[in-house]
């Protein structure tokens, strides 16, 4: 960027005169004119005359950043617009109001919904000029400053413009670009070009700008490469560029854009759950615990907007408390606390359950697993440790029908001393009126009654959920509330158990592994027969299948294990569907006896239902992010389903499914997945490429190189990057390999003269300027240019330096003859 005369001004308070850019060049050359061959600047010398210090008393100053009180001053500027076009623009981040005719980006406002993300964000495109301020000083010890505060949502950052005479002749550069977007957004940068010399350093730092928040280094020059993508998880990013001398490389160009940050998904507490409205700022996470567990911590957390969105507190936990008093008890659970942790290996837990006046308590033993030698559970009818014992695990078996208190309280005491086996306890309590029976409870089942108040005379009838059977089986599956003086049930409540085998003849149901939801025990050989109406067949959906290694579930397409094998299922398996050819299906589960093999061993859940036997393939779920078209209304044999995905998504799997003769589909239904690859960018003429990944996924690179004799025009490395809207894109256009011109050789230095910046080879288009020492005048062309060709040639012969007749210094610089 050329300097204008009015742009070079003295430092405030200094007495240095105003000088034009031409005068700056003259000063530097003047210093050289006084250096003859005796001063060491010989032809072929690689010392850099541009680093010469001006003569004593001749310092040249260019102002620092202008103050708001000095609207007339303006240092050298390079404007960078969001689309990366250079141009002159206003400067000074400190200016309170932009100069007339300019636009300044507004400071981020907490009330603003987010940064402007350009047309891709659905907004109308606006172009706001971003300013990079470059202040130049020729005093070698003072650095060139090029600082800039950027608050656009997207744009480019480029290294300082090194094309101006001042920049070409000066030393130190120290530039800091501070990019700042709205809170709740991070900044993604992409290195588009990077061509730095060894002495130059570019640092990328995240954060900073807040008290006590130091910036964190994301990358330095050695870690950066063209096409690389970096993400700052904060709303501030610093680029720090340092060059100890005139930058020799091609500088850098970096694209940046804001992206919306969110809170991480809060972990689900053990023995509880979490529901989240939104992970973005303002969203809430609500935690709740299973019955018998208490929430430790805040029930609701809010995702806070900030430099880095975060939940406004720690994730709570669900704890089974070791003891406590439950007042006005109605319905609930007592659960043993986790061994170890805060309670330690030895437990002494005492619970007091107090019902309201005139009510009694029923205690149902849901799950009990105590170490015979080290654990003890005692239940007392009453609210004190002296109340009469109604259950003692050292003496009594687990009561199948539970316990009933004589009073309105129960006292439960659990003692555990370093048990050899894990402790498991879950007791369900329920308060009921003294003049009636307690409400019966049936895990994995339903209770229907003739009297919801359970007064004497009430009947309670039990039935199990699909997959479970009553234990003990058969009638009576009902109990009666008897004795008006002291109401109680005339029999124990049954239990619902997942059985090993059985005959199932409902139109729909479930087959569960033995003892589900508990793990099945080894030594099982179970056979289930599923039978539906004669003209129907059976659709089996494998919901859960987690069986131990060596255990197997076999499905037979017919009645009995002699029928054709439909499938053999082992180990953990994903959900799948199977279809019988007729109305009968047999399932056999085999788990060898002996110690259980390692593995999950949880069990299985299989849903079945009868489906019409009308020679149709099973119904398939419609695709997400796409649609399907059927060749027929009914899914009869030969029906073709064609799947398509909407824009931004591509098909994973076969796009055409055919209903086959055996009424199964020719392939699994495909899915529409977000396009996460870039299109093949193509090969390059007169060059070759190397790709980091086949298929060009997001984050992959393609490096282009040219054949000998050709030079690369454009970015050498392209990176595939994702976008919030639209499909992934390459970071740049594919480069070209252009025929390389041979350089011109240095034509030599005229006797009694010298060249600027002596070097051996000059590329096509480069110019060379000659000067004569004092007392000599230049005959010929002052400047010659290397003209491209094969070979490239100089525009003319180098000039001569002959003894001058006059000592008028003006002729020496102009090269007049």
């Amino acid at each position: 960027l050329p300097l204008k005369e009015e742009e070079i001004l003295p430092e405030p308070g200094s007495e240095t005169p105003t000088v034009a850019s031409e005068a700056l060049a003259e000063l530097l050359h003047g210093a050289l004119l006084r250096r003859g061959p005796e001063m060491g600047y010989l032809p072929g010398s690689d010392r850099d005359p541009t680093l010469a210090t001006p003569p004593a008393g001749q310092t040249l100053a260019v102002p620092s950043l202008p103050r708001a009180t000095e609207p007339g001053t303006g240092p050298l500027t390079t404007a960078v617009t969001p689309n990366g076009v250079r141009g002159a623009g206003p400067t000074a981040p400190e200016l309170l109001t932009p100069p007339p005719g300019t636009t300044a980006p507004p400071p981020p406002s907490p009330a603003s919904p987010g940064p402007p993300l350009g047309p891709e964000g659905g907004e109308e495109e606006t172009t706001t000029t971003i300013i990079t301020t470059t202040t130049v000083t020729t005093t070698v010890t003072s650095p060139v400053l090029c600082n800039n505060n950027i608050s656009e949502g997207e744009g480019y950052v480029e290294s300082p413009d090194l094309g101006s005479p001042v920049s070409r002749t000066l030393g130190l550069l120290d530039c800091t670009y501070s990019i700042h977007v709205y809170p709740g957004y991070g900044i993604e940068i992409q290195v588009q070009t990077l061509n730095l010399s060894q002495e130059e350093e570019l640092l990328v730092l995240a954060g900073g700008g807040s008290p006590g928040l130091a910036p964190r280094l994301l990358a330095n020059s050695s870690m950066l490469g063209e096409g690389q993508v970096l993400r700052s998880p904060t709303n501030r990013l610093l680029l720090h560029f340092q060059s100890p001398r005139v930058p020799r490389g091609g500088g850098f160009r970096i694209h940046y854009q804001a992206y919306l940050l969110s809170c991480g998904f809060p972990p689900r507490p053990a023995h509880g759950d979490v529901s989240v409205t939104d992970l973005h700022p303002g969203g809430t996470a609500t935690f709740h615990c299973d019955s018998g567990y208490q929430l430790q911590g805040e029930e609701t957390l809010i995702c806070l907007n900030g430099t880095r969105p975060s939940w406004n507190g720690e994730t709570p936990s669900c704890m089974a408390s070791c003891g406590g008093t439950i007042h006005n008890a109605t319905l609930g659970r007592i659960v043993s606390p986790e061994p170890g942790g805060a309670v330690g290996p030895n437990l002494t837990c005492r619970w007091v359950i107090e019902a309201a006046e005139g009510r009694r308590l029923h205690l149902h033993f849901e799950r009990v697993s105590l170490d015979e030698d080290n654990d003890r559970l005692m239940v007392r009818s009453g609210g004190s440790p002296l109340s009469p014992v109604i259950y003692d695990s050292d003496m009594d078996d687990v009561p199948e029908r539970g316990l009933i208190s004589d009073a309105q309280s129960l006292y439960v005491e659990l003692l555990s001393e370093t048990p050899a086996n894990p402790l498991l306890l879950s007791l369900r309590f329920e308060a009921f009126e003294e003049d009636r029976c307690f409400a019966p409870f049936l895990a994995h089942g339903n209770v229907t009654t003739t009297d919801p108040e359970y007064r004497p005379g009430a009947l309670a009838t039990f039935s199990c959920l699909p997959g479970y059977a009553l234990e003990p089986p058969g009638p009576p599956n009902a109990i009666e509330c008897v004795d008006p003086t002291e109401p109680h049930w005339n029999d124990t409540e049954p239990a619902c158990k997942a059985m090993c085998g059985g005959e199932l003849s409902e139109p729909a149901g479930v087959v569960l592994s033995p003892d589900w939801p508990q793990s099945y025990s080894p030594g099982q050989d179970c056979v289930w027969g599923v039978h539906v109406q004669e003209e129907k067949r059976i659709l089996l959906q494998v919901e859960i299948l987690n069986v131990r290694e060596g255990d197997m579930l076999t499905l037979f397409d017919g009645d009995g294990p002699s029928a054709r094998v439909l499938a053999q299922l082992r180990g953990p398996q994903p959900r799948r569907r199977l279809l019988s050819s007729g109305p009968d299906l047999t399932l056999q589960f085999q788990a060898p006896p002996g110690p259980p093999n390692p593995g999950l061993g949880q069990g299985f859940v299989l849903h079945f239902k009868e489906v019409p036997r009308n020679d149709t393939c099973p119904e398939l779920p419609p695709p997400e992010w796409g649609w399907r078209t059927a060749s027929h209304g009914d899914l009869i044999r030969g029906t073709v389903l064609t799947y398509q995905c909407e824009p931004g998504y591509e098909l994973l799997g076969s796009d055409i499914l055919t209903c086959q003769w055996d009424l199964s589909w020719s392939a699994a239904p495909p899915a529409c997945q977000k396009i996460m690859t870039c299109a093949d960018p193509g090969e390059i003429a007169n060059g070759h490429r190397t790709a980091s990944d086949a298929g060009f996924p997001v984050g992959s690179h393609v490096q282009y190189r040219c054949l000998p004799g050709y030079s690369l025009e454009g970015a050498a490395m392209l990176t595939c990057y994702s976008r919030d809207t639209g499909t992934p894109k390459w970071s740049d256009r594919v480069p070209k390999c252009a025929l390389k011109y041979e350089p011109c050789l240095n034509p030599g230095v005229p006797e009694n003269g010298y060249q600027t910046l002596y070097k051996h080879h000059y590329q096509a288009g480069e110019s060379l300027r000659f000067f004569c020492y004092e007392g000599f005048e230049l005959i010929g062309e002052v400047t010659i240019t290397c003209v491209p060709g094969h070979p490239s040639q100089w525009t003319s012969q180098p000039p001569l330096c002959k003894v001058t007749q006059t000592t008028d210094p003006s002729r020496q610089l102009e090269g007049g003859n």
Partner: antibody
Framework: EVQLVESGGGLVQPGGSLRLSCAAS????????MSWVRQAPGKGLEWVAL??????????EYSASVKGRFTISRDNSKNSLYLQMNSLRAEDTAVYYC???????????WGQGTLVTVSS | DIVMTQTPLSIPVTPGEPASISCRSS???????????LYWYLQKPGQSPQLLIY???NLASGVPDRFSGSGSGTDFTLKISRVEAEDFGVYYC?????????FGAGTKVEIK
């Protein structure tokens, strides 16, 4: 036979509002994506808005030029698609077509169009 | 947004002669499954557009086989081997790789 019939077009002043309707028949309406595409007089085609099918929760997409001003909706009980157009501008003057997806992409079937003129 | 550029804007053709229309996209329309998300439509005077070709080269139902589509990546061509009277109108290319869906400006095939 698939049929799409647009209605509701007419003359409206800049800044005004208009609601276009598209009556669909001959197919299970809830299974299909529906779109509006417009064509300014003597100009080319421009996609305006899209509403997805039941399986995809009837969610919507809009072109940048109408986002915030136009709303696409559907009444599945009436097999009808709508385009509510607010803050109308002169450049919204066009023939508006209703289109349905199918075996051949998002615009497999088209209606005959309805003309909207925005002028003072 | 993906920009679709059609050339020429107008092409005079004698019935019975071949015709060729070009369409260029600013981004490759090839997805990893190998399909090109490019469509060709014909709009006859006073009518609604009708689909001719989907996925760059597949003829829609009822479209005569004198129409053919070809291309790769970003450059696509619609060819009519012998133009007939009912083929005159404006031809549009359209991409469905990403939202917003974008059409070319159109190429008018008119009688010479």
């Amino acid at each position: 036979e698939v049929q799409l019939v647009e209605s509701g077009g007419g003359l409206v002043q800049p800044g005004g509002s208009l609601r276009l309707s598209c009556a669909a028949s001959g197919f299970t309406f809830t299974d299909y994506y529906m779109s509006w595409v417009r064509q300014a007089p003597g100009k080319g085609l421009e996609w305006v808005a899209l509403i997805r099918n039941k399986a995809n929760g009837y969610t919507t997409e809009y072109s940048a030029s109408v986002k915030g001003r136009f709303t696409i909706s559907r009444d599945n009980s009436k097999n009808s698609l709508y385009l509510q157009m607010n803050s109308l501008r002169a450049e919204d003057t066009a023939v508006y077509y209703c289109a349905r997806n199918g075996l051949y992409g998002l615009f497999a079937y088209w209606g005959q169009g309805t003309l909207v003129t925005v002028s003072s | 947004d993906i920009v679709m550029t059609q050339t020429p804007l107008s092409i005079p053709v004698t019935p019975g002669e071949p015709a060729s229309i070009s369409c260029r996209s600013s981004t490759s329309l090839l997805e990893s499954s190998g399909k090109h998300r490019l469509y060709w439509y014909l709009q006859k005077p006073g009518q609604s557009p009708q689909l001719l070709i989907y996925y760059m080269s597949n003829l829609a139902s009822g479209v005569p086989d004198r129409f053919s589509g070809s291309g790769s990546g970003t450059d696509f061509t619609l060819k009519i081997s012998r133009v007939e009277a009912e083929d005159f109108g404006v031809y549009y290319c359209m991409q469905s790789l990403e939202y917003p869906l974008t059409f070319g400006a159109g190429t008018k095939v008119e009688i010479k």
